[in-house]
């Protein structure tokens, strides 16, 4: 494939990455799949600077990111190491709360209204953010 040198239409470029901000809601797994079909992934927050950028664009709205602990350890969807990476949890979070009455705990992370992170039931239909790196090989064949 060819290297992507600029962002697709309706995506926002920032620090050599492209971001797409949804305006509708999906369950975490559906949002994850949506991003993958766009040759991207749910946003992976690696710095305070990136956190502020995303926060500015999403506003005070619950929004999925690419972080989950559905198989035990917290994992970023692109393989970025959770343990050594940037974290911005709300105080007392993550708490794997069971009191929602929906069954099971809380396995998926989202931005809350103040931008800090919370774990929640993955089935909730929140907005989401896709991210793709500019310099990575595109899946599309090069133009002849």
């Amino acid at each position: 494939g060819s290297e992507r040198t600029c962002c697709p239409v309706n995506w926002v470029e920032h620090e050599r990455s492209c971001y797409w901000f949804s305006r509708s809601g999906k369950a975490w797994a559906d949002a994850d799949n949506y991003c993958r079909l766009e040759d991207a992934h749910l946003v992976v927050v690696t710095s305070w600077e990136e956190q502020k950028f995303v926060q500015h664009h999403i506003g005070p709205v619950n929004t999925w990111m690419g972080l989950h602990d559905q198989n035990g350890p917290w994992k970023w969807v692109d393989g970025t190491d959770y343990e050594t990476g940037f974290k911005n949890w709300r105080p007392e979070q993550p708490d794997d709360w069971y009191g929602h009455g929906l069954g099971g705990g809380e396995d998926c992370a989202h931005f809350t209204d103040d931008g800090r992170w919370n774990d929640d039931v993955c089935q909730r239909p929140y907005r989401w953010v896709c991210e793709t790196e500019l310099d990575k090989a595109s899946q599309e064949p090069p133009l002849l």
Partner: antibody, heavy 114, light 107 residues
Framework: EVQLVESGGGLVKPGGSLRLSCAAS????????MNWVRQAPGKGLEWVSS????????YYPDSVKGRFTISRDNAKNSLYLQMNSLRAEDTAVYYC???????WGQGTLVTVSS | DIQMTQSPSYLSASVGDRVTITCRAS??????LGWYQQKPGKAPKRLIY???SLQSGVPSRFSGSGSGTEFTLTISSLQPEDFATYYC?????????FGGGTKVEIK
């Protein structure tokens, strides 16, 4: 690498108390719910208690409620189980486990006998 | 409380056999179930999470299926190191509950 090491087990008389500890390493301790699970000699596994990452939520089965107290110290990466009013039926190997059992310690034996 | 009924309690099988263990929940727990293997004197080890997802590092001969109230752990071709006791665990709600266990022995 995730490591969980239990300690504090031993022989105690009925009605006595014991405090188990679990030292965790290799992961961001405060991000995870932690659990105690026990296994009586020759028997199956029994969940004993859970505590959320910041200690906001504590859970117990009826069999230990009011007698056992789970706690944690995130600054020390440590999980605890204070066991009071111990009974013979509390005799078991006690395991510390992370989240929903993706990682386990090696266990510590608690024997309640006169 | 949610009861987990596991069957059979004991199972005799030979190397190469296909082995199936079942757990039945007393109410719908969706896919909030894990399967664990335990060998004598050792801590349990998780094989399957969310009913059907294989834990990293676990051989592909292990598989999980089911949702709701009926769950199955299958070992497609039993190996010598698979002789152990297997447990299911529901984490749909507290109190968390284990199945009674299935001891897989050499025939």
């Amino acid at each position: 690498e995730v490591q969980l090491v239990e300690s504090g087990g031993g022989l105690v008389k009925p009605g006595g108390s014991l405090r188990l500890s679990c030292a965790a390493s290799g992961f961001t301790f405060s991000s995870y719910t932690m659990n105690w699970v026990r296994q009586a000699p020759g028997k199956g596994l029994e969940w004993v208690s859970s505590i959320s990452g910041s200690s906001s939520y504590l859970y117990y089965p009826d069999s230990v409620k009011g007698r056992f107290t789970i706690s944690r110290d995130n600054a020390k990466n440590s999980l605890y189980l204070q066991m009071n009013s111990l009974r013979a039926e509390d005799t078991a190997v006690y395991y510390c486990a992370r989240d929903r059992g993706s990682s386990w310690g090696q266990g510590t034996l608690v024997t309640v006998s006169s | 409380d949610i009861q987990m009924t596991q069957s059979p309690s004991y199972l005799s099988a030979s190397v190469g056999d296909r082995v199936t263990i079942t757990c039945r929940a007393s109410q719908d727990i969706r896919d909030n179930l894990g399967w664990y293997q335990q060998k004598p004197g050792k801590a349990p080890k998780r094989l399957i999470y969310t009913a059907y997802s294989l834990q990293s590092g676990v051989p592909s001969r292990f598989s999980g299926s089911g949702s709701g109230t009926e769950f199955t752990l299958t070992i497609s071709s039993l190996q010598p190191e698979d002789f152990a006791t297997y447990y299911c665990l529901q984490h749909y709600n507290y109190p968390l509950t284990f199945g009674g266990g299935t001891k897989v022995e050499i025939k």
